[in-house]
């Protein structure tokens, strides 16, 4: 048979061109990409490949070593001068490792038939590649009809005798894919039908999307799908200390590329993202929610001595409302309002003040008015009670003024203006207020209500009474109006500084109507209700003193 070098003997050694070719070619063989997993690489097998040639005088292995003395497994065949060639080379069993689509990369050289004298009728420039699926590692079968053809392989570039002389080796690389595979493994077969071929390397691999961490989600090594257009949806798992609202997913393409990310993981509260991992917030820092990017310093007047803090603790005498966000500074109650002034108008008081010097760090300052009625003699104060009205209101005042109406006249009051804010109710400290003492103006007194009859004679009636419930000032005098019953238009008026009088010059056995009113500097009050008393008959004795009902 013809040798590849063009001599017609059958050399047992590798011809020169093979050495030249391999030394050049092997230097160019690079490591496989990270998304390719080799099932077989003839270049890396140290011992016997365990391949079978059939018939035995067809394909032959050329034992060579590279510059590092590693064996090179090269198979060649060059029976271009003989008719009806059918030379088969069968690989050992190759596990597909769960892949349903595999790729076969062939590196080979092929002699140009035109450069071979006398072999034009029988010389071929192609060879065929087949596969046979099997679960059995020992099931190598050489029945040709059981093998499925993958493709006819032609060279992009063939070489001539001239190339040999110039030592220019034209190494072809062809890749074919096979799938879907359904069994645990397979055999490959190379059929020569009369070409001059050197099969330099066979690499069988599958593609995977390599494990990756993206958006804090770990996506595992994923073998690509059987279909070349298929996108496999892969669920990611969140890295330590991370959580997700939307489970992370990515799609693994047939080319072993990750595409179309959906969802993401976020570092949980108390952790932040650094270099694709979730790192703990250090003491002094916190992160309240997964949705916040990074740990932040504790806000003013707060601290944390923990790692992984989700909030900070308020310093002594500082507080945080439940509704305050954890990013807000801790705050304290305000100081007292300042410069309170009052303006009295009869039984109304208008108070005005300026805000506290220290609002406690809050904007929600409001004011509360406490009203106390004080006894000027005893110095004892009591709550004012419900009759006092506050305009616009008693508590929750936003403005720095208030009007109190319906106060008692000529009464000592103490008003406490307290500043409060959102944390005042959380503080055990003393109330912060400013006090204002006022005395309301005198007003007309209330009616006299309690009148007693004294000595009653035939021509006179003596009366006594108590000061009105609400004198509304200093009582200057009383005015007593009386008339004979049913003769209202003819009345008499007596004035008295005391709470007793005697009406004289009355008719015996007659009924008289009395009304009394008091006067202060502010004027007269209204008359009391009518009180009726009867003088005695001419011969009767004086009556005893008794209270009129």
């Amino acid at each position: 048979p013809a040798s590849l070098a063009g001599c017609y003997s059958a050399p047992r050694r590798a011809p020169l061109w093979t050495c030249l070719l391999l030394c050049a070619a092997l230097r160019t063989l690079l490591a496989s990409p990270s998304n390719e997993v080799n099932l077989l690489d003839s270049r890396t097998v140290m011992g016997d490949l365990g391949w079978i040639a059939f018939p035995k005088n067809g394909w032959e292995e050329i034992g060579e070593v590279d510059e590092n003395y590693a064996p090179i497994h090269t198979y060649q065949v060059c029976k271009v001068m003989e008719q009806n060639q059918n030379n088969w080379l069968l690989t050992s069993w190759i596990s597909n490792e769960g892949a349903s689509r595999i790729f076969i990369e062939l590196k080979f050289t092929l002699r140009d038939c035109n450069s071979l004298p006398g072999g034009l009728g029988t010389c071929k420039e192609t060879f065929n590649m087949y596969y046979f699926e099997s679960d059995d590692q020992n099931g190598r079968n050489i029945k040709e009809n059981q093998y499925i053809k993958i493709d006819t392989i032609a060279a992009d570039e063939s070489f001539t005798e001239l190339d040999l002389g110039d030592r220019v080796m034209k190494l072809n690389t062809e890749v074919r894919d096979v799938g879907p595979l359904s069994k645990k493994g397979f055999y490959l077969a190379f059929q020569d039908v009369g070409a001059c071929i050197a099969l330099v390397s066979v690499r069988v691999y599958y593609k995977k999307c390599p494990s990756v961490v993206r958006h804090l989600a770990v996506f595992p090594d994923t073998i690509t799908g059987a279909d070349s257009s298929q996108l496999l949806e892969v669920s990611g798992s969140c890295v330590n200390h991370s959580v997700t609202d939307e489970p992370p997913k990515m799609h693994c393409s047939a080319e072993g590329e990750w595409l179309v990310p959906i969802g993401k993981c976020m570092c949980k509260a108390g952790y932040e993202e650094k270099n694709g991992t979730c790192q703990v917030c250090r003491p002094g820092f916190f992160k309240a929610s997964p949705h916040i990017q990074s740990c932040g310093k504790c806000p003013p007047h707060s601290y944390t001595h923990e790692e992984a803090s989700t909030s900070c603790v308020c310093e002594k005498d500082y507080f945080r409302r439940e509704s305050d966000p954890p990013t807000m500074a801790c705050t304290r109650p305000p100081s007292a309002p300042r410069n309170a002034i009052s303006n009295v108008n009869e039984t109304s008081v208008f108070l005005e003040w300026i805000p506290p010097a220290d609002t406690g760090g809050r904007k929600d300052v409001s004011y509360y008015i406490a009203c106390k009625k004080c006894n000027s003699h005893a110095g004892v104060c009591e709550e004012c009670g419900g009759h006092v009205r506050y305009l616009p209101r008693q508590s929750g005042l936003k403005n720095t003024s208030v009007m109190m109406v319906d106060l008692l006249a000529h009464t000592n009051y103490t008003f406490e203006i307290e500043a409060v804010n959102g944390v005042s109710d959380l503080s055990p400290g003393a109330r912060q207020y400013v006090s204002v003492n006022v005395t309301t103006n005198q007003a007309a007194p209330s009616p006299v209500t309690n009148v007693k009859k004294g000595k009653i004679a035939k021509n006179s009636i003596s009366l006594s009474w108590q000061e009105p419930d609400r004198p509304n000032g200093i009582i200057l005098e009383y005015e007593i109006k009386y008339f004979e019953k049913d003769q209202e238009t003819s009345y008499t008026i007596i004035k008295s500084k005391e709470t007793t009088i005697t009406a004289e010059g009355l008719k015996p056995a007659s009924v008289y109507v009395f009304q009394i009113r008091a006067r202060t500097a502010a004027g007269y009050g209204v008359f009391s209700r009518r009180f009726e008393f009867e003088t005695t008959p001419v011969f009767a004795a004086s009556s005893d003193q008794s209270q009129i009902p």
Epitope: G284, K297, C298, Y303, H305, E307, V313, K316
Partner: antibody, heavy 120, light 111 residues
Amino acid sequence: EVTLVESGGGLVQPGGSRKLSCAASGFTFSTFGIHWVRQAPGKGLEWVAYISGASTTIYYADTVKGRFTISRDNSKNTLYLQMNSLRSEDTAMYYCARYGTSFPYGLDYWGQGTSVTVSS
Amino acid sequence: DIVMTQSPGSLAVSLGQRATISCKASQSVDYDGDSYMNWYQQKPGQPPKLLIYGASNLESGIPARFSGSGSGTDFTLNIHPVEEEDAASYYCQQSNEDPFTFGSGTKLEIK
């Protein structure tokens, strides 16, 4: 008023054990990290261990790691340092100190210390 | 571990003059814009007292004649004007990284 009072010191044989206590008052103990710091006679300060208020964060100096254990009982306002496999080089005045609240935190209050002597 | 190298080991300063103590960290003690460097004063028979935290912040109740400066690896404690009561040992400490190491100390004597 913030006070820290250490106790439990004394003479211990090499290889022996001792448990130090630190009683705290005048502040909300459970929210404060506390440190143990020691000082060998005539020498400088050496940081020993730290525990956060909720005991979630604990650190040790390399020289005591595996031999000393820091712990606390917030219900008793007390910090502890369990010292095992004691060596002569552990002889020192042991102070407990409170982590401060002004950032970045220093050790703002210290106890008066308790003396531990490791000798045969 | 971060090693804190303090210098000088001791110094004598006249009353009213300036005392300067240096502390050098074997690696930066800064984090997020803050320097985790503290200074303490210790008098014989007493526990240490915090003077400066965060390299330059004066602890409450400490006289303003104490000041701290520096960032990264180089820090300084200044006392000016020095008073009689300032005679003590001074220690720097980093709290950026566990273990929280102290410097070897500087003994200040008043002349």
